[in-house]
Structure formats: C-alpha cells, structure tokens
C-alpha cells in the first residue's frame, strides 16, 4: 500500500474574471483495488448513493474527472447497491480518471479495498482519512472548481505539475 | 463564481412557443445534469425534466411529453428550455437547476424566468 | 408516479422552537430523499440529501432523517431566517417529484 500524494488547487474567480489559486498537499494510500500510478482531473464530489444503479440512464460524463466520496457509517447505509470496490468501478466506467474515498466514518471500507482483486481497477483508487481527509473535505465542500494530483512520489514544485 | 444565469421574463399568447436559457459559469459544464422545474403563482415545484449536457439526451416528465425540447449548447456552456402550445396554466417561474453527480438533488438553481401566458 | 406527501402543510412557531416536519412517499425510495428551503420570490435553496447529508453552508440546526417512506426534516432551534416554505423531494426515479410544501410562520 503506497502512499498517494495528492495535490489539491482550489479556483478562486473575482468578479473582474480574474482568479487566484490555492494548493494544498495531503497524503493518502493507493488501494489494491486500483493502479498505483499518477492521474490528474477536476473533482467531482460524489456521494456513495450516487453510484447505485437506481437511475433510469446511462450517467455517463465526460472523462478525466476525479470522484472524490465521502463514505458514510456503515449503520446509514446496513444493504449497500453496491460494494466500495463496486462504487469505484462505476465511478471509473462513469469517466472518472481516479477516485479518492474518504473512509474517515467507515474504516472498514480499507480492508474491503485492498483485499487483493483478480482483475484491479487499470485507475488509482486512494483512500485518505484523519487530518487529510478534513482538509480535503474542506477544499471540495467549498462548491468552487479544484482539481486534483495523484501521484506516487512526492511532488517537487507545485508549479511544475499545474500549467494555470 | 458557480453560479446559473437564466434569461428574462417572457409575455406570450396562447398556442405560441417561449425559449428559456439557462448559463452556467464556474464549473465544468458537462459533468452535472441540468434539470427544469416550475412554479405556478402561489403553488409548489413542478419537475418538468432533464438533460445530460455530456451526451444531450434528455429524459422529460411525461405531463410535458410532446410539448416540451431541451437542448444545450457546449461552446457557450448554456442550456434552453423550450415549451410549445402555450395555456393560461403555463404561466409559472421556470427554474433551471443543476443536480449533483449520480444524483438527482439540486445544488445550483438559476434565479427564476417568469413566463406569462395571456391573450 | 410516486407521491411525496408532507405534513403539516403550514405551522405557526416562535424563535427557539424545535419545528419538525414531516414527508412521507407513496413507495420505499430508500434514502433518496432531498429538503429545500424556499423565500418568497426566491429559488429554492437545498438543506438536506440523501435523507440525512446537510449540503455545504447550511447550518447545522438542520438535520434530516428517515429511510424507505418516512422521513422528517427537524430545525432544532428556530432562527428569523427560517421562516419559509419547506419542500421534499425524491430523487429515486423520474419523474422527479416534490411534497407540496410546509409554510412556516412566526407565532
């Protein structure tokens, strides 16, 4: 289990259509469920709910993005559609590059993503919690366009990775 | 700024059409759905339907089948709504709303164009 | 289609007061359930998804509960700015349907 460093540059616009970024880094683990290499997209903030197969279409959006889900205490949610792992699947057959999940009230979600998985995801899949997981929590809940970077070796210079 | 910047009022005859549009700003226009709903003078919301900017494909409530065309347009990151045959019942604040990913709770709504139907 | 039935349909309260209101679905619709808050001649502004998830910004007086076809939208202690219409909504399946509104007013 690698550690995932990830990136986070929150999009401040002013009224003048001019904008100001903010990078925060935080660390999290690259799953087994996933591949353990590098992917960048904007976050799109998802809740566990959103990946069931309920809906009456197809879902689908673009590709590239980063679905970052908030997983709930396992007493909210006692029959999941769907396992962690399938929520990650959907996520990625749905466009997403890479999905962060926030296992911060359901720690067990960690060992139901690296039980080791015949045929892995071919995108990370990282799970992040305690004080990373808040500071990512905080930057997405923010409703303000951020993009993330996931990488396996600690980045340099943010400056390096982001062309604004 | 997030933000959906719907066009203005709009006084029309029974039987003609009213073409609403709906722009959006400070996300990525082709990941979240866009939705309509309305609301008659002094009644609750009304879904009327939805579209999936990505693809286009639209899925309507069926009261509006038939009557009822949204499209969207990528390059200016703007959606329309355009309702035909237009009754004294149609007159209503017409919302555009956007819906969270996967589901189909409404994060970001427009402000509201006020469509008066009267002969 | 399912019909999302709230209750009451209007309430009279006082500043401080514990308001609960209620809305119940024609068919289990697990936890897609959504709450808004409308102003007069306002848009409707999201409070509560997911049956029990406060969306960002909304303070945290609000909370929602329920699952399958009951579920209660709960202000614990009523500020000036609450007074409004409540409405629920079931993100289930299409069509997408509301409650038919809880006006609450200053006692």
């Known amino acids: 289990k690698e550690t995932a460093f990830v990136e986070v540059v929150l999009f401040e616009s002013s009224p003048s259509g001019d904008y100001t970024t903010y990078t925060t880094g935080l660390t999290g683990r690259f799953s087994r469920a996933g591949a353990t290499l590098s992917a960048e997209g904007e976050i799109v903030q998802m809740h566990p709910l959103g990946l069931c197969n309920n809906n009456d279409e197809e879902d689908l959006y673009e590709y590239g993005w980063v679905g970052v889900v908030k997983l709930e205490q396992p007493e909210l949610d006692p029959k999941p559609c769907l396992t962690v792992l399938g929520k990650a699947k959907r996520a990625v057959q749905r466009g997403a590059t890479a999905v962060i999940f926030d296992v911060s009230e359901n720690p067990e979600a960690i060992d139901q993503l690296n039980q080791g998985s015949e045929d892995p995801l071919k995108r990370p899949v990282v799970y992040v919690k305690g004080a990373d997981a808040i500071k990512l929590m905080n930057i997405v809940n923010k409703q303000k366009v951020a993009r993330a970077r996931i990488q396996h070796r600690p980045p340099r210079q943010p400056t390096e990775y982001f062309d604004m | 700024q997030v933000q959906l910047v719907q066009s203005g009022a709009e006084v029309k005859k029974p039987g003609a059409s009213v073409k609403v549009s709906c722009k959006a700003s400070g996300y990525t226009f082709t990941n979240y759905k866009m939705h309509w709903v309305r609301q008659a003078p002094g009644q609750g919301l009304e879904w009327m339907g939805k579209i999936n900017p990505s693809s286009g494909s639209t899925s309507y409530a069926q009261k509006f089948q038939g009557r009822v065309t949204m499209t969207r347009d990528t390059s200016t990151s703007t959606v329309y709504m355009e309702l035909s045959s237009l009754r004294s019942e149609d007159t209503a604040v017409y919302y555009c709303?956007?819906?969270?990913?996967?589901?189909?709770?409404?994060?970001?709504w427009g402000r509201g164009t006020l469509v008066t139907v009267s002969s | 289609d399912i019909q999302m039935t709230q209750s009451p349909s209007s309430l009279s309260a006082s500043v401080g007061d514990r308001v609960t209101i209620t809305c119940r679905a024609s068919q289990d619709i697990y936890r897609y359930l959504n709450w808004y808050q409308q102003k007069p001649g306002k848009a409707p502004k999201l409070l509560i998804f997911a049956a029990s998830s406060l969306h960002s910004g909304v303070p945290s007086r609000f909370s929602g509960s329920g699952s399958g076809t009951d579920f209660t939208l709960t202000i614990s202690s009523l500020q000036p700015e609450d007074f409004a219409t409540y409405y629920c909504q079931q993100s289930y399946t299409t069509p997408i349907t509301f409650g038919q509104g809880t006006k609450v007013e200053i006692k």
């Open positions: 709303a956007r819906s969270g990913a996967g589901m189909w709770y409404f994060d970001l």
